[in-house]
Each structure stands twice: as C-alpha cells, then as structure tokens.
C-alpha cells in the first residue's frame, strides 16, 4: 500500500448514547472525543441482542462510557487499552471523496465501519473507535 | 483498494492484540455481506499512551 493522500476523522464513536464533544481545539493531539451520532435517529448502541432460538432474543447492556473516561488528559490511559488496526477494503477504489469528510462517500464508509466495529466488539469491554483514516491501497 | 486505519479503545484487561485481531477476522465474511466491504490484510498492534492523532503513520505486527 502506498500513497500519501488520506482523509481522517478524529472522533470517538462509542457504545453508549452519543453526546456533543466537550474538547477544545487545544486538545487536538488526543483524537478521542464524543461526536453527535451519524444519524438523525436518536439511539443507544449499548444494547446487545443474542439469539437463543429462532423466535426469541434476550438483551444485555454494556455500560456506556462514564464522564471520567471522557477526559482529554493523559489520565484517559488509566484503565483503558488502545489498539491500532488497519485493513484493506479490496472492492473499493480510493478517490478524492475519501479525503473530504463532508462527502457522502466518506460519511457512508465511516458510518459502515463504525457500526461494524460497534457490533463486532460490543460484548467485550469495548469503549469505542476513533481516528478513522482512509488512504489508497 | 482503500486502506483503513483506526484506533480501538477497550477497558484495560478485557482483550489483547491477538483477540482483537481474531474477533475482527471472524466477522470479515459478514462484513462483506452486510456492508459490501471485502476486507483483507488485517493488522493490529498495541498503541502506547500518550499518543497523538498524528502518531499512526506506521505500525508493527
């Protein structure tokens, strides 16, 4: 993979009810903030559905982030592990739309990826994802 | 293709690098079907803290 062009989003999409970011421009170096949700539909993504048979579900909830976790200081590291993840999407072509967070293409891909991770990791202490970047493969 | 890079946050002690990668790889097929995203070349690494938004130009695995 090569190429320097990229787009990025420095927000934390997390598994609790979304709220407006309270960070200031001075805290730019820490990418974790709490964005408003990508959809007009108000939602809490903490609820988890597990199928027990073809006609029933039961529900459990992962507690949302607490306000102490929202700190933009290095204290955020207390009790939190971070992992950097990268992967290729081979059936998509990179284009200039993925350098511009205001484009539909960028927002749709970011929304799909965010939703996918919120679902994959919702059972295991997952707090959220941030700093999504796209670049050519 | 498009390379996607992002940072995941977990409660400390709940998961390790290997499990993050294993769980993600487990749902690659579903991702292809649900979101029309064909995912390959997955790489996961620990992020030392503190870190900056600009610190992810490289990673190891």
């Amino acid at each position: 993979a090569s190429g320097s062009a990229s787009g990025s989003a420095s927000t934390l999409v997390h598994n609790g009810t979304s709220a407006r970011a309270t960070t200031t421009p001075a805290s730019k170096s820490t990418p974790f903030s709490i964005p408003s949700h990508h959809s007009d539909t108000p939602t809490t993504l903490a609820s988890h559905s597990t199928k027990t048979d073809a006609s029933s579900t039961h529900h459990s909830s992962v507690p949302p982030l607490t306000s102490s976790n929202h700190s933009t200081s290095p204290q955020l590291s207390t009790g939190v592990s971070f992992f950097f993840l990268s992967f290729h999407i081979s059936n998509l072509q990179f284009n200039s739309s993925l350098e511009d967070p205001s484009t539909d293409y960028y927002q749709e891909l970011q929304r799909d990826i965010s939703e996918m991770f919120l679902q994959i990791y919702k059972q295991g202490g997952f707090l959220g994802l941030s700093n999504i970047k796209f670049r050519p493969g | 293709s498009v390379v996607v890079q992002l940072t995941l946050a977990f409660r400390e002690g709940t998961i390790n690098v290997h499990d993050v990668e294993t769980q993600f790889n487990q749902y690659k097929t579903e991702a292809a079907s649900r979101y029309n995203l064909t995912i390959s070349d997955v790489s996961v690494s620990d992020v030392p803290f503190p870190f900056s938004a600009q610190s992810h130009h490289h990673h190891h695995h």
Epitope: H37, H38, S39, D40, T41, T43, T44, L45, S47, S49, T50, K51, A54, S55, T57, H59, R111, D112, E115, M116, Q119, I120, Q123 | Q26, Y27, T29, E30, A32, S33, R34, Y35, N36
Partner: antibody
Framework: EVQLVQSGAEVKKPGASVKVSCKAS????????INWVRQAPGQRLEYMGW????????KFNEKFKGRVTITVDTSASTAYMELSSLRSEDTAVYYC???????????????WGQGTTVTVSS | DIQLTQSPSSLSASVGDRVTITCSAS?????IHWFQQKPGTSPKLWIY???NLASGVPPRFSGSGSGTSFTLTVSSLQPEDFATYYC?????????FGGGTKVEIK
Amino acid sequence: EVQLVQSGAEVKKPGASVKVSCKASGYTFTDNYINWVRQAPGQRLEYMGWIYPGSGNNKFNEKFKGRVTITVDTSASTAYMELSSLRSEDTAVYYCARDYPFPSYHYGMDYWGQGTTVTVSS
Amino acid sequence: DIQLTQSPSSLSASVGDRVTITCSASSSVSYIHWFQQKPGTSPKLWIYSTSNLASGVPPRFSGSGSGTSFTLTVSSLQPEDFATYYCQQRSSYPPTFGGGTKVEIK
C-alpha cells in the same frame, strides 16, 4: 410475540412511486435490522436492501440504487420502503424481514411480514 | 453477484419418502439459509447457517454442505412438507436466493 405487519396492496401507474410500511412489535425495534425482499410472480426472491433502526444506516442492492429509499420511524417501530419510477416489472409482493447484527448475523431473517402486493399497470 | 442454482426445480414425492434438494453456488460461500414457502404466504426461515433448524422445524429436516454445494434433506416426507424451498447466501453482497425447489405430492 414478534410480528411484522405490512401495509395493504397497492395499484400504481408506471412512473409513479409506492411506499410500503412494516410495523414491528414484540421485540426492541432498534436491536435488529429490517430487510426488504421482493418476489415477482413465479420468480425467485430478490433482495432489495436493509436498514438498521438503531442508527438509521442503510444499504441497497445496486440494482435498486437511486430508485429505492428505506427509512424508519423509531417512535412508531415502523420501517418504510419507497420505490420510485415504477415499471411493470416491479409488479411483485414486497416483504420486510428482520435479522440480526453481529455477532448473531448468521441466524438469518427469522421473521417476515405478510407481504404487500404492488401492481404496476397502465 | 453470487448465483445460487437449486436442483431439481421441482419434484414429486410421496409421504414417507426421503427427499434431497441441492443448492449450488457460483462462488464459495460460508454458509446458506433455507426458507420454506407455501402458496400465498411469506417465506419462513427453515434452516439457518447450513445445518441449524429454525424454531419449530421438525427434526426430520437436516441441512449440510460447504463451499459451493449444500443440501436440504427430509428423512420422511410428511403432508405439511409440501412447499417450495429456497436457499439463500449472505457471504457476499447483495444476498441472493436460489430459484426454488417445489416439492409436490406424487
């Protein structure tokens, strides 16, 4: 008891639009995906797209992109599928069906609406 | 799109017969689902993830297969089993369905 109840039959002229509703009950509406599938007379089932009421996110089969709109009203636990620029080959029974997010995605579409017959004729 | 081909497209059988329906995929898939549909009604999930019976489906039904070849088997056909059966893949977007196999009374 889980139920998906769809709106009644529609007769439309070519070029018109149709909006079919699907009201869910018996489960938490925002926990599950709603899919739309259609079946033309004597034909196989054809997948149209999905919406996740928990986020409003949706995705369409490329065949219908630009002609189909899928929305939800979470307060009414109802999903909607609107198909525009109708042509005679859109005559079909339209179904909504629910399924599951990861990691339960492999359970499939376990509950279906009763179907809405849409007839396109001049 | 992945094409699913079912065979036979129809079959006539008697109560008590053992019946096997096949579903062949144009590319390898992880698993398939099977649906049962009777005239004038909506499809019902019958077998999910290749081999798991949906709620209320009698144990005379079974599913198996992998890759590009999958089967639905009824060990001893009963009167209520006469219907059309569809396979579906969701390993690739968009999900696709087979053309159906109509099981009729001989």
